[in-house]
Interface confidence: medium
């Protein structure tokens, strides 16, 4: 089958890192500098991605694979393959149209990216606030006072029922 296929289409023999050059009788030619082909049988090579400005090179382009970028310090990647670099903020802040702003009371962000999220409402689970929330941290919920047996308040508090939440992007 491979032999039949190659007789019908000589380009199918061209491996990754080459292209089928119509200008040269469909000979397999190496990809020119700053280009690549990641699969065989390609009729053109793709231009390598260039990591410029706020992007920095994480992996150099080769004849068979594209360059990979990440972001310079103070920025983080967004999107597939680090399509964008977005400015970091401090914990306890979120990035708005006007720059980094502190989280409003009742919200928190424990990362340098993402948005401020509301504190957990412990009472919805019939619990009480064990540790107050801050701009940087969610509240920690614990048993409601009614759940504590007499004298329980003098011992080590129970483990939190819920870990501080992580702000999804």
């Amino acid at each position: 089958f491979e032999r039949t296929r190659s007789l019908q289409d000589p380009c199918s023999n061209c491996p990754a890192g080459t292209f089928c050059d119509n200008n040269r009788n469909q000979i397999c030619s190496p990809c020119p500098p700053n280009s690549f082909s990641s699969a065989g049988g390609q009729r053109t090579c793709d231009i390598c991605r260039q990591c410029k400005g706020v992007f920095r090179t994480r992996k150099e382009c080769s004849s068979t694979s594209n360059a990979e970028c990440d972001c310079t310090p103070g920025f983080h990647c967004l999107g597939a393959g680090c399509s964008m670099c977005e400015q970091d903020c401090k914990q306890g802040q979120e990035l708005t149209k006007k720059g980094c702003k502190d989280c409003c009371f009742g919200t928190f962000n424990d990362q340098k990216r993402g948005i401020c999220r509301p504190w957990t409402n412990c009472s919805l689970d019939g619990k009480s606030v064990l540790v107050n929330g801050t701009k940087e941290r969610d509240v920690v919920c614990g048993p409601s006072p009614a759940d504590l047996s007499p004298g329980a308040s003098s011992v080590t508090p129970p483990a939190p029922a819920r870990e501080p939440g992580h702000s999804p992007q």
């Epitope: 967004l78 999107g79 597939a80 979120e94 990035l95 149209k97 948005i115 702000s167 999804p168 992007q169």
Partner: nanobody
């Protein structure tokens, strides 16, 4: 599991308009993206919007395309005006996971700009 379903693609004449929609199951309290892939080309970034309304666009669509979202309907939109032949592509909506280690994709909707 996040599911993203695009709609609104079709055939339109140069200079025309289309509005794409992306319906998301689950939480879209996150950054949402539009990407596109033209025939024989690599997938490219079009625009994104954050849950607090910040937007960003690729240079090639700035001033012509508008990204928006309706969090109450879990829906992302892309209003495309002054369409050109080079806008012909399959358009995908996408979102990152919380750690930006994975991107979730819809199945895409085809936009063809031709006279």
């Amino acid at each position: 599991q996040v599911q993203l379903v695009e709609s609104g693609g079709g055939l339109v004449q140069p200079g025309g308009s289309l509005r794409l929609s992306c319906s998301a199951s689950g939480d879209i309290f996150s950054i949402m993206f539009w990407y596109r892939q033209a025939p024989g080309k690599q997938r490219e970034y079009v625009a994104h919007i954050t849950s607090n309304g910040r937007t960003n666009y690729a240079d090639s669509v700035t001033g012509r395309f508008t990204i928006s979202r309706d969090n109450s309907k879990n829906t992302l939109y892309l209003q495309m005006n002054s369409l050109r032949a080079e806008d012909t592509a399959v358009y995908y909506c996408a979102r990152d996971d919380a750690t930006n280690t994975r991107t979730y994709w819809g199945q895409g909707t085809l936009v063809t700009v031709s006279s």
